[in-house]
């Protein structure tokens, strides 16, 4: 996965800090106040979508080869820049019964991006 | 995740069989000769992109929160119909040294789809 640099337009990971107060979630999330969630952005042209390290999976590489060899549209839509690696984050929050709960929430932080 | 039934155009899983011969991989993959890779297709309108069952994660929900409020840099970030659950499959193939290898290859089969 590639981190977004200056004028990069290809699929990459953009660092981004989310503030829970800013999105109105501070009333139920106690800790942390925010976190570096990051997100994926950029283009996935067919010629790079199947490249190792850029393709999200073996599955992606297979479909992109098919897309390149067959009429467009036979195997789904365009390739999309999406998370390929994520990690969890511990959250301290109020549940629906106002109990304080500490849980590892999966897939909170985007670590790498690739073309779907 | 939804199964595509031809009636909906919302993000769903489409059944699809890949023949390794069709993509020119039959020279190094011994078995199987192909498999049901499946793929994701369909629309991810903003009102469903963050809903449970169609969304990828907490992360998607946060991004959708920003997107729906027109926040930069998310305003132009399109939600994509992508695999949310992939499964491995065993394959028998020749490695670079022409040894026959049996291995569980990760992320081969799309089991479920959702909106990124």
């Amino acid at each position: 996965g590639i981190d977004c640099q200056g004028g990069s337009r290809m699929c990459c990971r953009q660092e981004f800090f989310v503030d829970f107060r800013e999105i109105g979630w501070h009333d139920w999330i106690i800790q942390p106040e925010g976190y570096a969630m990051n997100f994926c952005i950029g283009q996935c042209p067919l010629h790079i979508a199947g490249m190792p390290g850029i393709a999200a999976s073996f599955h992606t590489a297979v479909l992109n080869l098919l897309k390149a060899n067959t009429a467009a549209g036979t195997t789904g839509g365009g390739s999309c820049c999406v998370p390929t690696a994520r990690r969890p984050l511990s959250l301290l929050y109020y549940d629906r019964d106002s109990n304080i709960v500490k849980t590892d929430i999966p897939d909170m932080v985007v670590e790498a991006c690739g073309c779907s | 995740g939804l199964e595509c039934d031809g009636k909906v155009n919302i993000c769903c899983k489409k059944q699809f069989f890949v023949s390794f011969k069709d993509i020119g991989w039959n020279d190094w993959i011994i078995a199987p000769s192909g498999y049901h890779a499946n793929y994701c297709e369909g629309e991810c309108p903003s009102h469903i992109a963050g809903t449970s069952g169609s969304s990828l994660s907490f992360h998607s929900t946060v991004i959708n929160h920003y997107r729906m409020r027109g926040h930069s840099p998310f305003a132009n970030l399109k939600s994509c119909c992508v695999p949310t659950k992939l499964r491995p499959m065993s394959m028998l193939y020749y490695d670079d040294g022409q040894n026959i290898i049996k291995k569980d290859i990760q992320n081969m089969i799309v089991e479920e789809c959702g909106c990124s």
Epitope: - | A31, P32, S33, L92, I109
Partner: antibody, heavy 123, light 108 residues
């Protein structure tokens, strides 16, 4: 977790029929060829029959050809063996086996086995 | 049809011994040979595929060699859990798929 559960075995008289079933879970059934392998009491393994993922290709051992019929239902993720004109020497533990391959040619490799169902042919 | 012949049909050995089982094909099968282990009352288990490749999770004391018509399965240092019956199987010319008659490995 891959599971293959055979059923339908039992005691049967020579000349009669029996149908074995194998219920499968834990993998994409229609990506794999499936087989029946039998083992007579105290004897070795004998391949009985195999069927490709789409039922297009089917094979039988000479010893059962014309008497046994293999079939599969991909929607029900089940494998079957219809055994007609049973003989005393068909007495065996019948295993349902998942092939790594999807077709019968190429490289069949028996990846996962059920625990077997016992068929006893006796008068 | 390709016939597979194993030898010996039975063998007695002690823990720590090095044991070799052979399998011969009636015609060349390249390296399309697999070995299975079966313990009493259990289903067979894949040990070695493609003549010499160890199935994932199988201890490294097991090894396979050979190509063409002659193949061997070697256990470098027998462990108590290795006493079982071993079968070779050809995957070259199929169907039919043929097994060797088996080699029973017993404690001396």
């Amino acid at each position: 977790e891959v599971q293959l559960v055979e059923s339908g075995g039992g005691l049967v008289q020579p000349g009669r029929s029996l149908t074995l079933s194998c219920a499968v879970s834990g993998f994409t059934f229609d990506d794999h060829a499936m087989h029946w392998v039998r083992q007579a009491p105290g004897k070795g393994l004998e391949w009985v029959s195999g069927i490709s993922w789409n039922s297009v290709s089917i094979g039988y051992a000479d010893s059962v050809k014309g008497r046994f019929t293999i079939s599969r239902d991909n929607a029900k993720t089940s494998l079957y063996l219809q055994m007609n004109s049973l003989r005393v020497d068909d007495t065996a533990l019948y295993y349902c086996v998942q092939d790594l391959n999807d077709i019968l040619t190429g490289y069949p490799l028996f990846d996962f086995w059920g625990q077997g169902t016992l068929v006893t042919v006796s008068s | 049809d390709i016939q597979m012949t194993q030898s010996p049909s039975s063998l007695s050995a002690s823990v720590g011994d090095r044991v070799t089982i052979t399998c011969r094909a009636s015609q060349s099968i390249s390296s399309y040979l697999n070995w299975y282990q079966q313990k009493p009352g259990k289903a067979p288990k894949l040990l070695i595929y493609a003549a010499s490749s160890l199935q994932s999770g199988v201890p490294s004391r097991f090894s396979g060699s050979g190509s063409g018509t002659d193949f061997t399965l070697t256990i470098s240092s027998l462990q108590p859990e290795d006493f079982a019956t071993y079968y070779c199987q050809q995957s070259y010319s199929t169907p039919p798929i043929t097994f060797g008659q088996g080699t029973r490995l017993e404690i001396k």
